[in-house]
């Protein structure tokens, strides 16, 4: 009879937590040093040996007395039923074709976990089972009492199962969902008594593969690989994840310490190509992602260092820096950005091996700048380095513009009092800190006579008392470096305040639109002046310089207020730099209704009439141009008198209204009255917007016809 190679010494152990049967056996009859391929047929039965539920052929290479192992994971918790295992073997090797037949079966090895359970009346399995959502799970209860009816509940909902035997019932849960991090609750309880048992089924969210897997080097010595782990499993402590990096060209492997990054030491043997597999693994499954790249194409340089800004003048500065080497022959492309007032104003790219240098031109004097530099691999761009930034301030230069100068001329006791005003130079014009202003007075009648006044900043004007002569005034602004061009204004012996008719202008949301007639002679420009706070002694004089070809402008200001009258003067500037008054304009940015009513005097009271008169009052103080007056008259009469019409007052009372549409009119005769009659009157001005406030009516009674006898 041919030699039979049968499995012997079969042992079966269990792992309840994993619902696994572990088989161990060996083959004794092999010759020494003989190694054969064999196939083992394994049968697993449940409850009774005739009920075979699993058959599997397991192929492996066998040596004499080698311990062979095989595991089987049961869908049903092992505590739910008795399991039996047997096996047989056959040689499956070309070396010994004559041995290709099955050996005898081993005897059945029985695994009965139930027998080791305690004497409790009820058990529920599996305990602490961990599965992924969407899985199918089998649970069971084992009852020690035939009499008792057992009900099982999944999250409070009764489940229906199949009876395996009188003591065991099985429940098949399909496509289990993730409910919560503390797991899914399953309870079983008996109808009689207070027997109740529960288990937790831990359902994890599906373990996702890592996303955005990427590797880069900063120094060609270490690769830093990063990834975004898949979403959380949703359980507190059950599922630890491990991440492994494997590089196929070198055959090296490393277990990553962190869940989203890992460092890899670059081979000293100048390996250029890398083929990484990142494997994420938890108790339930493995996920892998791959990445193939050339090392030199994944260089993320370190930030430039030794960055300096040197040779800073008023308009130029030089930036120098060093870069960290990324190999012997590589060139870095560096990007320089110049910031002024928070915005990029210059951008430049420079190729660098070790030292970088860049001249920044066309800078503004006395200005704060920030320059920053970053670099990337010029040959194979991957990523820019971080920026390295330096702040610097350019040197001062002499002011570039003449101050904007204006004047106010008053005649006081035979002298000419000139108030000079100037606007501070803008940052761009000042080119540094203005320290003082020089005012030079040149008497045009005695040209050799010059007088210098030095006025410390931040003054914005000065007052000069001059004789009746003509003067030319030169104003310059000065900083630590030098002097600005001079602003020249002339004052003649004649104050030049000739009478000019005032014209009304209407303001809009945008401001006042002013226009004037072009001058026939030579003018070097025009000036529009106004007060931002009329009526205030300080007035806050404002002016606007305009070119010689300009005949209109819009004056706008946030200071303009509704109901305030603004007066504008338009001056022409002669070739001798003497201002002369051309036009006057007056108006409101927005008219309002009159703020008060005039005081009215009544006179000439007769049986048939009386006369009303009122004082003129300052038009300047009115919140709009008065266009006329409304006179309201109340009487017992049903009809309104000629010249008046019916009107309804705000208190719904009815009266008669006379409209006086001449604002200059200051008297009015109320006629056609009845003798011995009672009247009430009230006078209010109106503007384009409406009438003044409604005030108290004045009472009057006409005498009877005979009262004078």
């Amino acid at each position: 009879e041919p030699l039979s190679l049968a499995p012997e010494s079969l042992e079966v152990s269990i792992d309840s937590a994993r619902q696994c049967l572990h088989l161990k056996w060996s083959v004794h009859n092999l010759a020494y040093h003989q190694e054969l391929k064999m196939v083992f047929q394994i049968e697993i039965s449940r409850i009774k040996t005739s009920n075979v539920i699993w058959v599997e052929n397991y192929s492996t290479t066998v040596k004499r007395n080698q311990v062979l192992r095989w595991s089987w994971e049961s869908k049903l918790p092992l505590e739910c039923a008795k399991h039996s295992v047997r096996m047989r073997g056959a040689v499956d090797d070309a070396q010994v074709p004559e041995l290709r037949f099955w050996s005898n079966w081993t005897s059945w090895e029985e695994v009965d976990v139930q027998s080791s359970l305690g004497h409790d009346p009820l058990f529920v399995f599996p305990k602490d089972k961990l599965v992924e959502e969407g899985s199918n799970v089998t649970i069971c209860y084992v009852s020690r009492s035939h009499q008792n009816n057992i009900s099982c509940y999944l999250e409070g909902v009764r489940m229906h199962g199949e009876q395996l035997d009188p003591n065991v019932c099985v429940f098949h849960l399909k496509n289990v969902p993730f409910i919560r991090e503390t797991g899914t609750n399953i309870y079983c309880k008996a109808d009689q008594g207070d027997v109740i048992k529960g288990i937790v089924l831990f359902v994890s969210k599906v373990f996702e593969e890592p996303k955005d897997f990427s590797c880069e080097t900063r120094d060609l010595k270490t690769l830093n690989c990063t990834w975004a782990p898949g979403s959380d499993a949703g359980l507190l402590t059950q599922l630890s994840q491990s991440y492994t990096l494997f590089e196929s060209f070198s055959g090296k492997k490393t277990l990553c310490k962190y869940k989203s990054w890992c460092n890899w030491q670059v081979s000293p043997d100048s390996q250029e190509m890398y083929n990484f597999t990142l494997t994420a693994e938890n108790y339930l499954r493995k996920r892998s992602v791959h990445l193939l790249f050339n090392l030199t194409h994944r260089v993320h340089p370190m930030a430039p260092f030794n960055v300096f800004v040197k040779n800073v003048s008023a308009t130029n500065a030089t930036m120098t820096w060093k870069v960290h080497s990324i190999g012997n022959y590589s060139t870095l492309l560096c990007q320089i950005e110049l910031y002024g007032e928070g915005k990029v104003i210059q951008k430049q790219n420079v190729s660098v091996k070790v030292n970088g240098k860049h001249l920044m031109k066309k800078l503004e004097p006395s200005t704060e700048y920030a320059a920053q530099v970053r670099c990337a691999n010029a040959n194979h761009f991957w990523k820019w380095s971080e920026w390295t930034r330096r702040n610097f301030t350019t040197a001062e230069a002499a002011p570039s513009e003449a101050p904007d100068v204006w004047r106010n001329v008053k005649s006081v006791q035979g002298h000419c009092v000139v108030t000079l005003f100037w606007k501070p130079l803008s940052k761009l014009q000042a080119n540094g800190k203005i320290l003082f202003y020089n005012v030079v007075l040149e008497n045009l009648d005695r040209p050799s006579t010059l007088k210098l006044l030095s006025i410390p900043a931040p003054a914005n004007g000065t007052e000069l008392t001059l004789d009746r002569c003509s003067y030319q005034i030169h104003v310059t602004a000065n900083n630590s470096v030098g002097t600005s061009p001079a602003s020249v204004i002339a004052v003649s012996g004649d104050p030049g305040n000739k009478e000019v008719e005032e014209e009304r202008v209407k303001g809009t949301e945008d401001g006042f639109c002013l226009s004037w007639k072009p001058q026939p002679g030579d003018v070097t420009g025009y000036v529009v002046e106004w007060c931002e706070r009329p009526g205030d002694p300080l007035c806050d004089l404002q002016w606007k310089n305009l070119g010689p070809n300009t005949t209109s402008t819009v004056v706008s200001s946030d200071a303009f207020r509704p109901g305030v009258r603004y007066n504008f003067r338009i001056y022409g500037i002669s070739t001798e730099r003497i201002p002369y008054l051309l036009e006057k304009k007056t108006g409101y940015s927005q008219e309002l209704v009159p703020s008060d009513n005039p005081q009215v005097l009544m006179s000439n009271l007769t049986s048939y009439s009386f006369t009303l008169s009122w004082k003129d009052y300052a038009a300047e103080s009115q919140p709009g141009f008065v266009q006329g007056y409304s006179l309201y008259l109340k009487s017992k009469a049903a009809r309104c008198l000629p010249g008046s019409e019916k009107a309804v007052l705000s208190d719904d009372s009815i009266c008669c209204k006379y409209k006086i549409d001449n604002p200059k009119q200051k008297t009015f005769v109320v006629e056609n009255l009845q003798p011995a009659s009672f009247y009430e009157f009230f006078l209010t001005p109106y503007t384009s917007v409406g009438e003044g406030p409604q005030g108290a009516f004045t009472k009057v009674t006409t005498p009877d016809e005979y009262s004078h006898i």
Epitope: G118, G156, R180, N185, Y187, I199, T237
Partner: antibody
Framework: EVQLVESGGDLVKPAGSLTLSCLAS????????MAWVRQTPEKGLQWVAN????????YYLDSLKSRFTISRDNAKNTLYLQMNSLRDEDTAVYYC??????????WGQGTLVTVSS | DIVMTQTPLSLSVSPGETASISCKAS??????VAWFRQKPGQSPQRLIY???TRHTGVPDRFSGSGSGTDFTLRISRVEADDTGVYYC?????????FGQGTKVEIK
Amino acid sequence: EVQLVESGGDLVKPAGSLTLSCLASGFTFSDYYMAWVRQTPEKGLQWVANINYDGSSTYYLDSLKSRFTISRDNAKNTLYLQMNSLRDEDTAVYYCARGLTWDFDVWGQGTLVTVSS
Amino acid sequence: DIVMTQTPLSLSVSPGETASISCKASQDVDTAVAWFRQKPGQSPQRLIYLASTRHTGVPDRFSGSGSGTDFTLRISRVEADDTGVYYCQQYSRFPLTFGQGTKVEIK
């Protein structure tokens, strides 16, 4: 009769240590999750820790994790709570509780732990 | 952490009436809620689990309802023995947390 009896409560100084025990009877101890819950007048009931059937998984209130250790000995039907670096705010009645899952169907009578200098 | 807020904090009921205690969770806890009663000088006893399942031996006068964030314990036909402090507990997420308790007294 199902019973849980706590012991080990005592007066202890701050930074001291204490071990609480809970002896279970009347049921198969290894078939149940077990827990410690404490109670103070200020904070009411506060879950401290849980342990699964065989002690392979433990769960803690985060703020106590570094100082408290829950363990069990199924052969002795006993649950333990080892408390280190005790603080004034750990003063409470400590209950041992049986859990079918995470809610507690049987509670012991409690043991008082007082932390004071 | 999930905060369990009970209302009212105290309740006085006459025998035979119905008492209602509300428990609001600061996040969705589906039905992982239990109710306990603690009588003076005693340890807590479980009444309800999984929001609405009565514990063995608990009279049907006690009923629990709700899911998500709003839960209610109702005690109908209140008896003198129902006095005590009632607590809700969530076990949907760690840390497991309890409500602050509702004191029920019988007039």
